[in-house]
Each structure stands twice: as structure tokens, then as C-alpha cells.
């Protein structure tokens, strides 16, 4: 495939990535799948600068990101290393809280109303952000 040089319609370009901001809510897995079907992934935050950009666009609304610990360790959906990477948890988070009464703990990360991160029940219907890299080869066949 050819390299994508422009962001798709309704996506926002920033620092060689394209971002799409939902206005409805989905469970984390459904949001993850939505982004994959768009040849993208849930947003992976790698810097304070990117954090501020996303925060500016989502406003004070709970919004899923591409970080989860459903299979054990915290993992970014694109393989970015959690241990050495950027983190912006709220104080005392993540806490894998069991007190919500929904069964199990909290395995999916989201931006909170102040932009800092919290872990929550993955089934909650939050807004989400998709991201795709401009330099990534697109799935479209090259023009002959």
C-alpha cells in the first residue's frame, strides 16, 4: 500500500498523526474495534504535548484511550512500552477498584474530566479517540 499523506475527512492532523474524536459512547472493546475497522487504533499517548492536544479536543469528558491490563500487565494497543512510556494517572490511580458492584476490577484506562487517567470497568460506554500515523502505509492499493 501507499503511504498516507493526508488525514481522512473529519480527522484532525497533529504531529504526523491523525485523530478522530467520537461524540457517542461505546464499551472499550467496541471502541477498540471501531478504530481497527478504520485502520487505526485507540489513542496512544506518548508525550505531555500529545496529552495536552487530546485533552484540548475532548474537553472534560470521560474518554477511552488505548491502554488496558485485561491480560495482566498494562499494555498500549500499538505495542508502545508502558513501563518506559509517558504516564498521567490521577493520584492513587490505577486502583483496580472492586466497589462499583459490577463484578471484577477495572482494566481499561480513560481520560477523566481533568485529562488525567483513571482505570475503569471496560464495559462503561465512554467516548473514545482513534489515532493513526500519517507515515503508516495505508491499506489502499497503489495507483498504477
Amino acid at each position: 500500500g501507499s503511504e498516507r499523506t493526508c488525514c481522512p475527512v473529519n480527522w484532525v492532523e497533529h504531529e504526523r498523526s491523525c485523530y478522530w474524536f467520537s461524540r457517542s459512547g461505546k464499551a472499550w472493546a467496541d471502541a477498540d474495534n471501531y478504530c481497527r475497522l478504520e485502520d487505526a487504533h485507540l489513542v496512544v499517548v506518548t508525550s505531555w504535548e500529545e496529552q495536552k492536544f487530546v485533552q484540548h479536543h475532548i474537553g472534560p469528558v470521560n474518554t477511552w484511550m488505548g491502554l488496558h491490563d485485561q491480560n495482566g500487565p498494562w499494555k498500549w494497543v500499538d505495542g508502545t512500552d508502558y513501563e518506559t512510556g509517558f504516564k498521567n494517572w490521577r493520584p492513587e490511580q490505577p486502583d483496580d477498584w472492586y466497589g462499583h458492584g459490577l463484578g471484577g476490577g477495572e482494566d481499561c484506562a480513560h481520560f477523566t474530566d481533568d485529562g488525567r487517567w483513571n482505570d475503569d470497568v471496560c464495559q462503561r460506554p465512554y467516548r473514545w479517540v482513534c489515532e493513526t500515523e500519517l507515515d503508516k502505509a495505508s491499506q489502499e492499493p497503489p495507483l498504477l
Epitope: D69, Q70, N71, G72, P73, W74, Y82, E83, K87, W89, P91, E92, Q93, P94, D95, D96, W97, Y98, G99, G103, G104, G105
Partner: antibody, heavy 114, light 107 residues
Framework: EVQLVESGGGLVKPGGSLRLSCAAS????????MNWVRQAPGKGLEWISS????????YYADSVKGRFTISRDNAKNSLYLQMNSLRAEDTAVYYC???????WGQGTLVTVSS | DIQMTQSPSSLSASVGDRVTITCRAS??????LGWYQQKPGKAPKRLIY???NLQSGVPSRFSGSGCGTEFTLTVSSLQPEDFATYYC?????????FGQGTKVEIK
């Protein structure tokens, strides 16, 4: 590489106390809840306590409530289990484990006997 | 508290056999269940998480299924290194509870 190393086990008399430690490395310790699980000789596994990443939430099995105290020091990447009023039935290998049990230490043996 | 009833408590099998172990929860636990393998003198090792997902590095002959109250661990073709004791663990609510264990022995 994720590593959990328990220490502090040994022989103690009934009614005595012991403090177990679990030294963690290879992962961001404060991002994970931690647990203590024990196994009496020839018996099955028994969950005994959990603590959230910041220490805000703590849970105990009824069998140890009021006698054991779980704690953590995130600055030292360490998990602890303070065991008081020990009984013969507390004799077991004690394991520390991360969150829902995706990684375990090798265990430390606690023997309560007169 | 949620009780986990595991069966059988032991079984004898031969290399190549298909083996199935069951855990039943006393109330619904969604898919908040893991399966663990333990060999003598060693720490438990997680094989399956959230009832049906294979832990990284675990051979594909191990599989898990179930949701709610009935859960199954299957070994499709038993290998010499699979002779061990297996436990289920529910982490849906505190106190977390293990099944009683199933010892898989060589026939």
C-alpha cells in the same frame, strides 16, 4: 523481566509474629494491585489478602482478618505482610502475586510450631 | 462468599489424551476466572485469563471456556510436562476463591 522475591519466612511459636516481604522489579510497581496467597503443606491455594496500587483499598480473607496486615512501599517496590497471633494452621508457603495472578514469586515457608 | 467447586479432584491419563477439568461458581462471576498450573515445589503459573484467553507463552493445547457459573479447562493432547495440579481462581469479588484443585497423574 518481572521478578517477585519473597523473604521473611521461618519457624515461629504459636502466638508469635512474623513480617514477610516481597521485593518487586521489572515493572511499574505502583500501577498494580498485589496479593498474598498461601498454601499449607499438601493442600490447595488460599487467597489471603490484596492491596490496590496506591494502598487505598485493602481486602482480607476471614481466616486472617484482625491478625494479618498487608501494606506496601511504592518507593521501595516492596509488598509486606505483618502476621501476628500466629497459629499452627497458618503454616504454609506464602506467595506474593501481581494483580489477578499473572506473575508469582517463588514463595517463602512459614512454620508455626512449638 | 463465592464458592468454586472444581472436579474431578484427581484423574489419571496418558500422554496424548484429551483432558477436561470443570469449575462451578456458586453465583455468576461473568468471565472473571483464571486457570493455574502448579508443579510440586513450584509457584503456580497462569494458563488462562478471563475464562478463555490463553496467557502469552502457554501452549495452544490448553484452552478455556465458560461464562457465568460453569467453566472448563481443556488440554487437547496431554504432554509429559502437563502432569501437575490445576486450579481455577475467581476474581469477580472479594474474597477471591480458588477451586480445590485437580491433580493430573500418569496412568
Amino acid at each position: 523481566e518481572v521478578q517477585l522475591v519473597e523473604s521473611g519466612g521461618g519457624l515461629v511459636k504459636p502466638g508469635g509474629s512474623l513480617r514477610l516481604s516481597c521485593a518487586a522489579s521489572g515493572f511499574t510497581f505502583s500501577s498494580y494491585g498485589m496479593n498474598w496467597v498461601r498454601q499449607a503443606p499438601g493442600k490447595g491455594l488460599e487467597w489471603i489478602s490484596s492491596i490496590s496500587g496506591s494502598g487505598s483499598y485493602i481486602y482480607y480473607a476471614d481466616s486472617v482478618k484482625g491478625r494479618f496486615t498487608i501494606s506496601r512501599d511504592n518507593a521501595k517496590n516492596s509488598l509486606y505482610l505483618q502476621m501476628n497471633s500466629l497459629r499452627a494452621e497458618d503454616t504454609a508457603v506464602y506467595y506474593c502475586a501481581i494483580s489477578s495472578g499473572w506473575s508469582w514469586g517463588q514463595g517463602t515457608l512459614v512454620t508455626v510450631s512449638s | 462468599d463465592i464458592q468454586m467447586t472444581q472436579s474431578p479432584s484427581s484423574l489419571s491419563a496418558s500422554v496424548g489424551d484429551r483432558v477436561t477439568i470443570t469449575c462451578r461458581a456458586s453465583q455468576g462471576i461473568r468471565n472473571d476466572l483464571g486457570w493455574y498450573q502448579q508443579k510440586p515445589g513450584k509457584a503456580p503459573k497462569r494458563l488462562i485469563y478471563t475464562a478463555s484467553n490463553l496467557q502469552s507463552g502457554v501452549p495452544s493445547r490448553f484452552s478455556g471456556s465458560g461464562c457465568g457459573t460453569e467453566f472448563t479447562l481443556t488440554v487437547s493432547s496431554l504432554q509429559p510436562e502437563d502432569f501437575a495440579t490445576y486450579y481455577c481462581l475467581q476474581h469477580n469479588s472479594y474474597p477471591w476463591t480458588f477451586g480445590q484443585g485437580t491433580k493430573v497423574e500418569i496412568k
